[in-house]
Interface confidence: low
């Protein structure tokens, strides 16, 4: 190999060992019959050398640095050449470095031809191995602007006081042009300006200078986004840190076309603007930091550009001004991530601050819109607390558990609407009365409606799930001892059509000791399946539940248990079941931890089934499933 560098070219070539590898044989640069591991070639030198091995690219790298001095004479502006030509260099991993020094008053602009650049974060690498590392200067301090790959949106980077550009090319890469040019500009009065051009839909992730380390103190950095007028841009902050400011405040400023309040100032912790039409600028402004404990300012953000969606011009009013203790969250439903570009799906408050999820609270009227290609990607979860603090005031008071129509009119599917029902301990209990009798969801008779009510204890220490209930059954009411949550969960978009079937009234009633009482009025045509609460985990220790089963005068009820034995093993206490005729008070008592469960029995009158648990040994839980079937009395039961 021969490398000859012209005089006054201000080029230095350095060949040195790369990152050490565990290769068996060492390799050397051979020059004048001497074996060396590093070779430096300066302007005006001509050197001939060889390598002592067949694949020097596994051992050595080459750095070509050109110093461009714009302080003492005119600057060589225009397209930057790769010198020496790559064809004259050994096939090693190559880094071309251009170090441009200029006056503070001179702006320097790097212009990148297509393909434009894409910024990468720490630890990331470029698919083709070609990287552009760009840094600037503040006095004597080097500031990293960023590392970039090809195929992105960054078209120009403007700096002042100097710029250092390093282009890294893998040994096998055929590239023989720098891909950029340098132009002079007037002073930009800030650290740098990065221009990012979108031709169509897409996204760009960008970072503050020095990221992930701290942004220089009291500096200003601007990103200019060029966006076709027919598209919309949204900004979201992926990661940021704030330093400890002594004077001034760290902030981002937007210059948004058409805004009457330019520049719009946001804190970094604010929701950032979305749904912006056309070009806009974003600037990051640092502060004077505390000398003792400066902390760091850093920012990584994403700009997402997409077509405006049909919904983006519609405003929906969610009036929660008359609600109390309620919150509504619109959020993405969990889905498998796709690697290809997926347009963002945002919900916007007042059409401007857009984010992937939004929580609205009671007491206000909210105006929202959507910036989303497919609203089925979002769903809604609502929580409302109804509490009674004074038992004298609440007793016999009723509340309707119904999804407000404002919420049903939103173009997003409702997932859960949860009511937390709180009562004063040992003073009051609750009764749930459905508009339409309920069916308990069981494996034997699953619910197939578009929604269900999930009823569970809301006492933190108590793990008690009463079950899932849907309209169209025989359960007339559910009484519960203490705090519960009732969640209306939807399973199909058809809930909108079936919404009229929802309707549950809760009343505060005098306190009773049983955990729950189910009032069941079976229909003559169907078999009613009932199961103990906490089906999968077993009825909690020392818990008692009852079913009040009505039998019409002209009917007979057949009570059937689906196991021969309960399976419960008691550690302390006894588990028992009482079946009591309500008219005669005659009762049968079964020891669930000892006796076999009763064979199918016939009841001519309304009756009670009460199940009380002991403290079971782990793994031997109490789970019972039983059914009630009505038949006309005229049938000969023998």
């Amino acid at each position: 190999f021969e490398i000859a560098l012209p005089r006054e070219s201000n080029i230095t070539v350095l060949i040195k060992l790369g990152t050490p590898t565990l290769l068996a044989k060492p390799c050397y640069i051979v020059i004048s019959k001497r074996h060396i591991t590093m070779l430096s070639i300066k302007s005006g030198e001509r050197i001939v050398f060889t390598f002592s091995c067949q694949s020097p690219e596994n051992h050595f790298v080459i750095e070509i640095q050109k110093n461009i001095d714009c302080m003492s004479g005119p600057c060589p502006f225009g397209e930057v050449q790769l010198q020496p030509s790559t064809s004259l260099l050994p096939t090693l991993n190559r880094t071309f470095i251009w170090d441009v020094k200029a006056h503070k008053s001179i702006g320097l602009e790097l212009q990148f031809s297509i393909p434009r650049l894409r910024q990468i974060g720490p630890g990331e690498s470029c698919p083709d191995g070609v990287t552009h590392s760009i840094s600037g200067r503040i006095d004597a301090t080097v500031v990293r602007i960023g590392t970039f790959c090809s195929n992105g949106t960054v078209s120009r980077i403007k700096m002042q006081e100097g710029v250092k550009m390093a282009l890294h090319l893998p040994w096998f890469h055929p590239r023989n042009v720098s891909g950029f040019s340098i132009a002079n500009r007037s002073s930009i009065k800030r650290l740098c300006i990065i221009e990012s051009v979108f031709e169509g839909e897409g996204s760009a992730t960008l970072m503050s200078a020095n990221y992930p380390e701290g942004f220089p103190e009291d500096e200003l950095m601007t990103w200019q986004f060029v966006v076709p007028a027919h598209l919309r841009a949204s900004v979201s902050f992926l990661n940021f840190n704030l330093s400890n400011c002594e004077r001034k405040e760290e902030r981002v400023e937007y210059y948004i076309p058409g805004s009457t309040t330019n520049p719009e100032v946001f804190k970094l912790e604010d929701k950032q603007p979305g749904n912006m039409a056309g070009n806009f600028n974003l600037s990051l402004q640092g502060c004077d930091q505390d000398a003792q404990s400066p902390g760091i300012l850093r920012l990584q953000f994403q700009v997402l550009v997409q077509h405006p969606q049909n919904e983006s011009n519609k405003i929906y009013v969610v009036d929660l001004s008359n609600e109390r203790a309620m919150s509504l969250t619109i959020e993405p439903r969990p889905v498998k991530q796709s690697r290809k570009f997926v347009p963002g799906c945002f919900v916007c408050l007042e059409s401007r601050t857009c984010s992937s999820n939004l929580t609205l609270t009671s007491g206000s009227k909210h105006k929202i819109s959507f910036l989303c290609d497919d609203l089925t990607r979002l769903w809604m979860n609502v929580e409302k607390t109804i509490s009674c603090t004074d038992h004298r005031y609440c007793q016999r008071k009723s509340y309707s558990l119904q999804v407000p129509s404002d919420i049903l009119h939103l173009p997003v599917e409702l997932h859960d609407f949860s009511w937390k029902l709180l009562v004063p301990k040992d003073r009051l209990s609750l009764v749930l009365v459905p508009a339409q009798k309920l069916q308990q969801h069981t494996h034997e008779k699953p619910c197939n409606t578009s929604f269900s009510y999930l009823v569970a204890s809301a006492i933190p220490s108590q793990d008690l799930y009463f079950g899932s209930f849907c309209p169209g059954g025989s359960i007339k009411q559910i009484q519960v001892k203490q705090n519960i949550s009732v969640t209306l969960r939807t399973f199909a978009p058809s809930f909108q059509q079936e919404a009229s079937r929802q309707g549950l009234t809760v009343s505060f009633i005098p306190y009773f000791k049983e955990e729950g009482v189910f009032t069941v009025t079976p229909d003559t045509k169907s078999k009613v399946y009932l199961r103990t609460p906490n089906w999968d985990r077993g009825l909690p220790s020392l818990t008692s539940v009852s079913w009040n089963i009505s039998v019409p005068r002209d009917q007979v009820a057949c009570l059937t248990f689906f196991k021969e034995r309960s399976g419960v093993v008691c550690q302390t206490g006894r588990a028992f079941m009482i079946i009591q005729e309500q008219r005669t008070r005659a009762e049968e008592i079964f020891s669930l931890d000892e006796d076999v469960l009763p064979k199918p029995s016939f009841h001519h009158h309304s009756f009670w089934v009460n199940i009380s648990n002991c403290s079971p040994t782990s793994g031997k839980q109490l789970d019972l499933l039983f059914s009630v079937t009505l038949t006309p009395r005229t049938v000969d039961l023998t």
């Epitope: 630890g123 969990p334 991530q337």
Partner: antibody
Framework: QVTLKESGPGILQPSQTLSLTCSFS??????????VSWFRQPSGKGLEWLAH???????RYNPSLKSRLTISKDTSSNQVFLRITNVDTSDTATYYC?????????????WGQGTSVTVSS | DVLMTQTPLSLSVSLGDQASISCRSS???????????LEWYLQKPGQSPKLLIY???NRFSGIPDRFSGSGSGTDFTLKISRVEAEDLGIYYC?????????FGGGTKLEIK
Amino acid sequence: QVTLKESGPGILQPSQTLSLTCSFSGFSLSTSGMGVSWFRQPSGKGLEWLAHIYWDDDKRYNPSLKSRLTISKDTSSNQVFLRITNVDTSDTATYYCTREGSADWEALDYWGQGTSVTVSS
Amino acid sequence: DVLMTQTPLSLSVSLGDQASISCRSSQTIVYSNGNSYLEWYLQKPGQSPKLLIYKVSNRFSGIPDRFSGSGSGTDFTLKISRVEAEDLGIYYCFQSSHVPWTFGGGTKLEIK
């Protein structure tokens, strides 16, 4: 190539804290998708998963032992650590660390040879 | 916890014959991304476990094609089409879809 090696105290007494180190090479725990798990196996018995740490410092623990376990990592020195507090004789076992390389196999593709730990008074 | 039940407990097979090991999970082990993280490991005496099959049916690099995995939902099978002497040891199924990650009790493969 990928290797993992466990080290520990060998013997310790009940109620003491067991500290284990997994030193690895051939991969970096700063790579997206990488993770390291700890398992144990009492002599002649089956395997039990204890804890897992991901490249982004997210952690998973076996709920039955969670209150006693702490997993951590030092990415720069290629090490993962596991602490088990308040040990008793039932913690006597061979302890293994393993790599999960989700980019490649999404499974525990490489295991250390194990380190034997005896808890005895 | 997801209980992994392996059958049989031990298996005695002549060289060249087929061996089949079953693993049943107490609940479905499909993860939220659609993958079933069900693996098979072989632990030879005095050694650490070695990965054979990942994600139900994918062979790990360097594993001979006589090993195959199949199944879905809660029922999974490992088949060794022609048993060789080096295949003896304890085979474990393992799920990492749900925390805690759990192993089957193991199946000991012996050569007749």
